[in-house]
C-alpha cells in the first residue's frame, strides 16, 4: 500500500474533495486548472494529457456553474467532426444540446470554452490559454 | 466519534482538499462559494456567517491565484475605517499593501473584488452578488 | 454604459513625441484587450496597436513598430499610447477601442486628433 | 502584410438590398468583421465572425463568405445606412495584427 499515505476522517456536516492533482481546484469532485501559457489546441490537448488530465469537458451546468463566472476564453476540448458537422469532446461523445451556446468567431474546428457556457469556434493553430479537467472517480 | 463517518486513502501523486462546505470550490484548502443573488455588504457578510464562513478575504496573489480569473464584481469581506482611512479585513487585519489595486468607483466604504486583483470602492448598501470563503484547519 | 475617451492630441512636429490618453468606464477593463485604430484625414481606418488586458502581450503595426509603444493602468482604468519619432504620415484621428474578441471592436472613442506638422 | 481590397463606392435604392464585398487571401482563413462609420463619428461594428450581430445591429444585416471574398449585405436598405463600411481581418502573416480594407462608401438613393 506504498502509494497510499494519509488516512483522514471527515466531518459529516463538511467533506472533502477530490483527489485532485496538487493545487488544482476542485469543485463537486472534478478536478480544474487554468493554464496562463498561450498554446495552440494540440499543444493543449497534450499538455493536459501529460497531467492524466484532459482539456476541459463541460457535461452539465449544475455540476460545473463555476464555469459560468470564468473570464477571457480558453481552449476546450470540443472539436468539430467535418464528417458528419457534429462537435465532440476529446472522448468521443457528442456536445449535449442546449449546454453550451456555440459562436462561430472564426474559421475552425475547434472551441474555446467563454463565460457563461459560451464555445467560441476558432482555427485549432491559434495560441490561447487553456483549461485541464480531471474527472475524480 | 459520530460525526465521523468516512475513512479515504490518499494516493501520494494527488491530495483532497478541504474539508469545506458540501457544493463549494476547494482550492489550495480554501473554500470558497460565489453567491448569485444580490445583496447589500452587511446582508452579504450575514449570509456568509450564516454558513459558518466569511466574505472574501484576500491575503495571497498565490495562494488564490484562482481569483485572477474572476469576472465580474462581487462584495469580499474589506471596509474602510474612516477614523484611521485604513481598509481592513472582517478578522481585524489591515489590508497588505500590493495585494489589491483599490479603484474608487464609488463613494462608500465597503470594497467589491474585481478580476485580477482589484478592488472597487462601493456605497455599502448597493446590492451585490458576493464570494463567501472559510479558511481550513 | 462603456465610455472610452481619448485625450493627448494636439499639433507637434516631425520627430516629436506624444502621448494619448483613453480613460474607459462602464466595464471591467483589465478583463478586456485593447486597440488603438487611426484614421487619416479623409482616409480609411488603420489598425495601429492592440495590448490584452493584463498588458503582457503588445501588438504593432508594422508602420509604427520601434516608435510606437501601447501600454495600460489597470488601476486608474486607462490606456495609453506613447508616439516618438513622429512623421507626416501619422497626422490621423486616433481612436481607442475595446476589443469584443481579438480583432472583433465592439466599443469605439470619439477620437483625438494628432497633426504632425513643421 | 494582407490586403484587403473593397469598392469605393455603391449606391442602392431605398428599400432595395445591397451587397458590399471584400478581397483578400486572409479572408480565405479568417472571417471578416464590419464597421459603418458615419461622418464625423467612430466607427461601429456590425457584422462580426461568421454572421453575427452586436446587440443594437438591426437584423437587415448580414454577413457571409466564400472563398477569399467577404460579403456585407443590407437587406431593405434604409436611408440611416448611408455610411462608410469598412471590412476588417487578421493579418494572414501574424494572427496578433489585423488590416482594414480601403472602405466603401454607400449611397442610398
Known amino acids: 500500500n506504498s502509494l497510499f499515505n494519509q488516512e483522514v476522517q471527515i466531518p459529516l456536516t463538511e467533506s472533502y474533495c477530490g483527489p485532485c492533482p496538487k493545487n488544482w481546484i476542485c469543485y463537486k469532485n472534478n478536478c480544474y486548472q487554468f493554464f496562463d501559457e498561450s498554446k495552440n489546441w494540440y499543444e493543449s490537448q497534450a499538455s493536459c494529457m501529460s497531467q492524466n488530465a484532459s482539456l476541459l469537458k463541460v457535461y452539465s451546468k449544475e455540476d460545473q456553474d463555476l464555469l459560468k463566472l470564468v473570464k477571457s476564453y480558453h481552449w476546450m476540448g470540443l472539436v468539430h467532426i467535418p464528417t458528419n458537422g457534429s462537435w465532440q469532446w476529446e472522448d468521443g461523445s457528442i456536445l449535449s444540446p442546449n449546454l453550451l451556446t456555440i459562436i462561430e468567431m472564426q474559421k475552425g474546428d475547434c472551441a474555446l470554452y467563454a463565460s457563461s457556457f459560451k464555445g467560441y469556434i476558432e482555427n485549432c493553430s491559434t495560441p490561447n490559454t487553456y483549461i485541464c479537467m480531471q474527472r475524480t472517480v | 466519534n459520530s460525526l465521523f463517518n468516512q475513512e479515504v486513502q490518499i494516493p501520494l501523486t494527488e491530495s483532497y482538499c478541504g474539508p469545506c462546505p458540501k457544493n463549494w470550490i476547494c482550492y489550495k484548502n480554501n473554500c470558497y462559494q460565489f453567491f448569485d443573488e444580490s445583496k447589500n455588504w452587511y446582508e452579504s457578510q450575514a449570509s456568509c456567517m450564516s454558513q459558518n464562513a466569511s466574505l472574501l478575504k484576500v491575503y495571497s496573489k498565490e495562494d488564490q491565484d484562482l481569483l485572477k480569473l474572476v469576472k465580474s464584481y462581487h462584495w469580499m469581506g474589506l471596509v474602510h475605517i474612516p477614523t484611521n482611512g485604513s481598509w481592513q479585513w472582517e478578522d481585524g487585519s489591515i489590508l497588505s499593501p500590493n495585494l489589491l489595486t483599490i479603484i474608487e468607483m464609488q463613494k462608500g466604504d465597503c470594497a467589491l473584488y474585481a478580476s485580477s486583483f482589484k478592488g472597487y470602492i462601493e456605497n455599502c448598501s448597493t446590492p451585490n452578488t458576493y464570494i463567501c470563503m472559510q479558511r481550513t484547519v | 454604459e462603456v465610455q472610452l475617451l481619448e485625450s493627448g492630441g494636439g499639433l507637434v512636429q516631425p520627430g516629436g513625441s506624444l502621448r494619448l490618453s483613453c480613460a474607459a468606464s462602464?466595464?471591467?477593463?483589465?478583463?478586456?484587450?485593447m486597440s488603438w485604430v487611426r484614421q487619416a484625414p479623409g482616409k480609411g481606418l488603420e489598425w495601429v496597436s492592440a495590448i490584452s488586458g493584463s498588458g503582457g502581450s503588445t501588438y504593432y503595426a508594422d508602420s509604427v513598430k520601434g516608435r510606437f509603444t501601447i501600454s495600460r493602468d489597470n488601476s486608474k482604468n486607462t490606456l495609453y499610447l506613447q508616439m516618438n519619432s513622429l512623421r507626416a504620415e501619422d497626422t490621423a484621428v486616433y481612436y481607442c477601442?475595446?476589443?469584443?474578441?481579438?480583432?472583433?471592436?465592439?466599443?469605439w472613442g470619439q477620437g483625438t486628433l494628432v497633426t504632425v506638422s513643421s | 502584410s494582407s490586403e484587403l481590397t473593397q469598392d469605393p463606392a455603391v449606391s442602392v435604392a431605398l428599400g432595395q438590398t445591397v451587397r458590399i464585398t471584400c478581397q483578400g487571401d486572409?479572408?480565405?482563413?479568417?472571417?471578416a468583421s464590419w464597421y459603418q462609420q458615419k461622418p464625423g463619428q467612430a466607427p461601429v461594428l456590425v457584422i462580426y465572425?461568421?454572421?453575427n450581430r452586436p446587440s443594437g445591429i438591426p437584423d437587415r444585416f448580414s454577413g457571409s463568405s466564400s472563398g477569399n471574398t467577404a460579403s456585407l449585405t443590407i437587406t431593405g436598405a434604409q436611408a440611416e445606412d448611408e455610411a462608410d463600411y469598412y471590412c476588417?481581418?487578421?493579418?494572414?502573416?501574424?494572427?496578433?495584427?489585423?488590416?482594414f480594407g480601403g472602405g466603401t462608401k454607400l449611397t442610398v438613393l
Open positions: 477601442a475595446k476589443e469584443l474578441y481579438r480583432e472583433y471592436m465592439d466599443y
Open positions: 476588417n481581418s487578421r493579418d494572414s502573416f501574424s494572427i496578433h495584427q489585423n488590416v
Open positions: 486572409s479572408l480565405r482563413s479568417y472571417y
Open positions: 465572425g461568421k454572421n
Open positions: 462602464g466595464f471591467t477593463f483589465s478583463s478586456y484587450a
